[in-house]
């Protein structure tokens, strides 16, 4: 039997179990250099010389329930939120800083999910439906990844999901939100 696929705010039900390395998204912000933002310094391209491992990409743990329309996981799941500015740590603003110290004019990097893990959850539904098992895809690690010019930011992470098939002996439920709406919320977390 196939696993039903659906999107959650920060999760996705998946058909297979395992770890999922993600190819780097082909994206770019397409922003131009602004000297005022750069503190009047000459253009600097830190990403051309610095190793990606030096960039600050934080993995923040957070806990939430998986939802599908009126259904909700019996228990919350814990996953990572990718956070942070993907620039060399020495150039990032500290706690006292009042804004960006620089904006790279070269390739744009973002802190986004790198690997995923699958976890089974138990989904509880109202209205006399029996609980059922689902596999959900959770962020397992984050990485600074290069964005290219071909796509806009709204497509930063667009998982493909198949439409949910109605279960036998049960009425199909309307989706709570569209995949795109969930995607936008997911991206805003970054």
């Amino acid at each position: 039997q196939g696993w039903q696929a659906f999107k959650n705010d920060a999760t996705e039900i998946i058909p297979e179990l395992g770890e999922y390395p993600e190819p780097p998204p082909e994206l770019e912000n397409n922003k131009t250099m602004n000297r005022a933002e750069n503190g009047g310094r000459p253009p600097h391209h830190p990403f051309e010389t610095k190793d990606v491992s030096e960039y600050s990409c934080r993995e923040l743990h957070f806990t939430r329930y998986v939802t599908d329309g009126p259904c909700r996981s019996a228990k919350p799941v814990t996953e990572l939120v990718c956070s942070g500015q993907c620039g060399p740590a020495r150039l990032l603003p500290n706690a006292i800083g009042r804004g960006k110290w620089w904006r790279p004019s070269g390739p744009d990097f973002r802190c986004i999910p790198d690997r995923y893990r699958a976890q089974r959850v138990q989904l509880l539904c109202p209205g006399g439906e029996a609980p059922r098992a689902r596999k959900v895809r959770l962020v397992a690690s984050c990485k600074c990844k290069r964005l290219t010019r071909f796509h806009n930011q709204s497509e930063l992470k667009d998982f493909g999901t198949e439409a949910a098939r109605p279960q036998k002996g049960r009425k199909p439920r309307p989706r709570a939100r569209s995949a795109k709406a969930n995607q936008a919320e997911l991206e805003n977390a970054y």
Partner: antibody, heavy 124, light 108 residues
Framework: QVQLVESGGGLVQPGGSLRLSCAAS????????MNWVRQAPGKGLEWVSF????????YYADSVKGRFTISRDNSKNTLYLQMNSLRAEDTAVYYC?????????????????WGQGTLVTVSS | DIELTQPPSVSVAPGQTARISCSGD??????VHWYQQKPGQAPVLVIY???NRPSGIPERFSGSNSGNTATLTISGTQAEDEADYYC???????????FGGGTKLTVL
């Protein structure tokens, strides 16, 4: 107090049919999900079927799918299990069980009250 | 479906603590229920949703569930606790209520 009384069990030949009943009392029957669970002689428990309070959702174990049909008559406070194409491996004590629900989502849907069971023997 | 595995038997001296395990892949993400069944009788729910006791069940019965193992704990075990114990949970992709194989608790 809550009472569940099963009936309709007996000896039947392989390929035959039988209809089990479960008379409920002591609670608002139509508000509760009900289940059938069976236990072969000397073996463990096996869930058979589930029906929601308004009969809109029914589920079955793979072992009985297509052969058994669960239904209910809320006006009579009675749960049924129609068993067709019976096999020797269907021989068991059949229990009807009320599902315990709490909170908006019902919780994990455990079975808080059970009948005493009715024995179904499939043999030639 | 997730298979639920229980030890066939557990023995305990009166007054001691009995622990019955129920293992299954990531069962900690699922609500687990425990049933007690004495010979010739119908099952009785003793723990629901991992660690909740129905009314009328003695306080010595408790449950926990984490990772790959759910556990039923009976503190100060009494002779009347001798019975078969089953764990269970809705673990199917299409709803399926799965019982563990059962554990026979013997009070020595």
């Amino acid at each position: 107090q809550v009472q569940l009384v099963e009936s309709g069990g007996g000896l039947v030949q392989p390929g035959g049919s039988l209809r089990l009943s479960c008379a409920a009392s002591g609670f608002t029957f139509s508000s509760y999900v009900m289940n059938w669970v069976r236990q072969a002689p000397g073996k463990g428990l096996e869930w058979v079927s589930f029906i929601s309070g308004d009969s809109s959702n029914t589920y079955y174990a793979d072992s009985v799918k297509g052969r058994f049909t669960i239904s209910r008559d809320n006006s009579k406070n009675t749960l049924y299990l129609q068993m067709n194409s019976l096999r020797a491996e269907d021989t068991a004590v059949y229990y009807c069980a009320r599902t315990f629900m709490h909170g908006h989502l019902g919780g994990g849907l455990s079975m808080d009250f059970w009948g005493q069971g009715t024995l179904v023997t499939v043999s030639s | 479906d997730i298979e639920l595995t229980q030890p066939p038997s557990v023995s305990v001296a009166p007054g001691q603590t009995a622990r019955i395990s129920c293992s299954g892949d990531n069962i900690g993400s699922f609500y687990v229920h425990w049933y007690q069944q004495k010979p010739g009788q119908a099952p009785v729910l003793v723990i629901y949703d991992d660690n909740n006791r129905p009314s009328g069940i003695p306080e010595r019965f408790s449950g926990s569930n984490s990772g790959n193992t759910a556990t039923l704990t009976i503190s100060g075990t009494q002779a009347e606790d001798e019975a078969d114990y089953y764990c269970a949970s809705w673990t199917g992709v299409e709803p399926d209520y799965v019982f563990g194989g059962g554990t026979k608790l013997t009070v020595l």
